[in-house]
C-alpha cells in the first residue's frame, strides 16, 4: 500500500509550555534560529544541569515558550496544542534509512512503496536540546526571525546540525559535525 510521507506540513514554531514539560525529548524545532548556529562547537553542559528535570529550568509552569524574535511585551496569540504538528520523538531507525533512500531518488511523495519500505520521519537527535535552548535564550535573544521550515528536508538539515546528547558528542551522525550553540 502506498503511504504519503508524514510531517511535511509547515511547522508552527510557537510551542506551549505543556508541550515542553510533557515531553522529555523536545526536538530542535523548540530552539529556533540562533545566529551562526552551524558555525560554533557543541555545548558541554554540567551533569547537574543535564540531569535536572525540565520543569526546574523553565521560568514558571504557566510560561509560554515562544520564538526569540517575539517581544516580551507582546502576548503571543493562543495556540491550540492539538493543532500543532509536532515531530515524533522516537521514530524507528529504519524509517530514517527509507527517508534517505527516497531523497536519493529525488522524490518526496506519491511513491508506491512495498510494506516494509515506509517513508520516514527524521530521527529526533536532541533529547536535551530544550535545556540548551533555555540557557541560550537567557543570554542571547536574536532579533532575527526564526527560519521558516516549510520544507521537510530543511528541518532534517537543521536537526542534523545538533548532537543528540550534549554529553555524548560521539553519537552525532557521521555526516554532520558537532556544533556549539554558544
Amino acid at each position: 500500500t502506498g503511504t504519503k510521507i508524514a510531517y511535511e506540513t509547515k511547522v508552527d514554531l510557537v510551542q506551549t509550555s505543556e508541550a515542553i514539560q510533557e515531553s522529555l525529548y523536545p526536538t530542535a524545532q523548540l530552539c529556533p534560529s540562533f545566529e551562526e548556529a552551524e558555525a560554533t562547537p557543541s555545548p558541554v553542559l554540567p551533569d547537574i544541569v543535564m540531569e535536572a528535570p525540565l520543569n526546574s529550568l523553565l521560568p514558571s509552569a504557566g510560561a509560554s515558550v515562544v520564538q526569540p524574535s517575539v517581544s516580551p511585551l507582546e502576548a503571543p496569540p493562543p495556540v491550540s496544542y492539538d493543532s500543532i504538528k509536532l515531530e515524533p520523538e522516537n521514530p524507528p531507525p529504519y524509517e530514517e534509512a527509507m527517508n534517505v533512500a527516497l531523497k536519493a531518488l529525488g522524490t518526496k511523495e506519491g511513491i508506491k512503496e512495498p510494506e516494509s519500505f515506509n517513508a520516514a520521519v527524521q530521527e529526533t537527535e536532541a533529547p536535551y536540546i530544550s535545556i540548551a535552548c533555555d540557557l541560550i535564550k537567557e543570554t542571547k535573544l536574536s532579533t532575527e526571525p526564526s527560519p521558516d521550515f516549510s520544507n521537510y528536508s530543511e528541518i532534517a538539515k537543521f536537526e542534523k546540525s545538533v548532537p543528540e546528547h550534549a554529553e555524548l558528542v560521539e553519537d552525532s551522525s557521521p555526516e554532520s559535525e558537532p556544533v556549539d550553540l554558544f
Epitope: 509536532l86 521514530p91 543528540e164
Partner: antibody, heavy 118, light 112 residues
C-alpha cells in the same frame, strides 16, 4: 511517573477476535511511535508492529500483518491492538511498548494475557 | 528478517562470578547513519522486560555498571562483571536497524 496499562485480554474462542487497549500516561503520547510485542508462554519475545504519532504509518511484522490491526486515539492517550481469527498460537502476553533507540527511557507495559481455548 | 542468535541458551552462574552472553546477527546491524541499534533487555521472573543497554554499549538509567555491552557489525556481547541474585532472568538482544525489528531467542541466567 510513566505508565503503560494494557487491558482487554482474557479467554477467547478459536476463530474469535478481541481488541486490546493500552492507556498511557507520564509522557507525550501524541509525539511517540508505539509498538506491540507479544510473548507466548515459555517462549521469547515477538515484535508485532508499530504505529507513528498521527497514525499515517503503521508497520507490521510481515508474517503477522493479516492477523493484527494497530490503531491509536491520541485524545484518549490510548493504543489499540485488534486481533482477528485467533488461534491457539495467539495465546500470549501482549505488551504495549514505547521503544526508544537513540537514548534512555524505553517503556514497557505490564502486559495483558490472552488465552485462546474452546 | 534479521535473525538474532543468542548463546548460550542457559547460563548457570555462582553469585559474584562473571557472566557473558553472545548475540550474533544474520546481517550487519550498522545503520547508514553510523550507529548500531542493538538493545539488551532483562526480563525478571514474572515481570515485563526492562531495557539494560541501548546503542550496543550505553547503559539505561538506573542500570548498575557491572553490566557492559560491546560488539559491532554482527557480533555482540553482554557481560556481567559480578553476578548478583537480582540479575537472574531472561536476557534478550533486540535490533532496530532493519525492518522488521527482531529479538534474539533469549538466554536464561540462573543462579547456581
Amino acid at each position: 511517573e510513566v505508565k503503560l496499562l494494557e487491558s482487554g485480554g482474557g479467554l477467547v474462542q478459536p476463530g474469535g477476535s478481541l481488541k486490546l487497549s493500552c492507556v498511557v500516561s507520564g509522557f507525550d503520547f501524541r509525539r511517540n511511535w508505539m509498538s506491540w510485542v507479544r510473548q507466548a508462554p515459555g517462549k521469547g519475545l515477538e515484535w508485532i508492529g508499530e504505529i507513528n504519532p498521527d497514525s499515517s504509518k503503521i508497520n507490521y511484522t510481515p508474517s503477522l500483518k493479516d492477523k493484527f490491526i494497530i490503531s491509536r486515539d491520541n485524545a484518549k492517550n490510548t493504543l489499540y491492538l485488534q486481533v482477528s481469527t485467533v488461534r491457539s498460537e495467539d495465546t500470549a502476553l501482549y505488551y504495549c511498548v514505547r521503544p526508544v533507540w537513540m537514548y534512555a527511557m524505553d517503556y514497557w507495559g505490564q502486559g495483558t494475557s490472552v488465552t485462546v481455548s474452546s | 528478517d534479521v535473525l538474532l542468535t543468542q548463546t548460550p541458551l542457559t547460563l548457570s552462574i555462582t553469585i559474584g562470578q562473571p557472566a557473558s552472553i553472545s548475540c550474533k546477527s544474520s546481517q550487519s546491524l550498522l545503520h547508514s547513519d553510523g550507529k548500531t541499534y542493538l538493545n539488551w533487555l532483562l526480563q525478571r521472573p514474572g515481570q515485563s522486560p526492562k531495557r539494560l543497554i541501548y546503542l550496543v554499549s550505553k547503559l539505561d538509567s538506573g542500570v548498575p555498571d557491572r553490566f557492559t555491552g560491546s560488539g559491532s557489525g554482527t557480533d555482540f556481547t553482554l557481560k556481567i562483571s559480578r553476578v548478583e541474585a537480582e540479575d537472574l532472568g531472561l536476557y534478550y538482544c533486540w535490533q532496530g536497524t532493519h525492518f522488521p525489528q527482531t529479538f534474539g531467542g533469549g538466554t536464561k541466567l540462573e543462579i547456581k
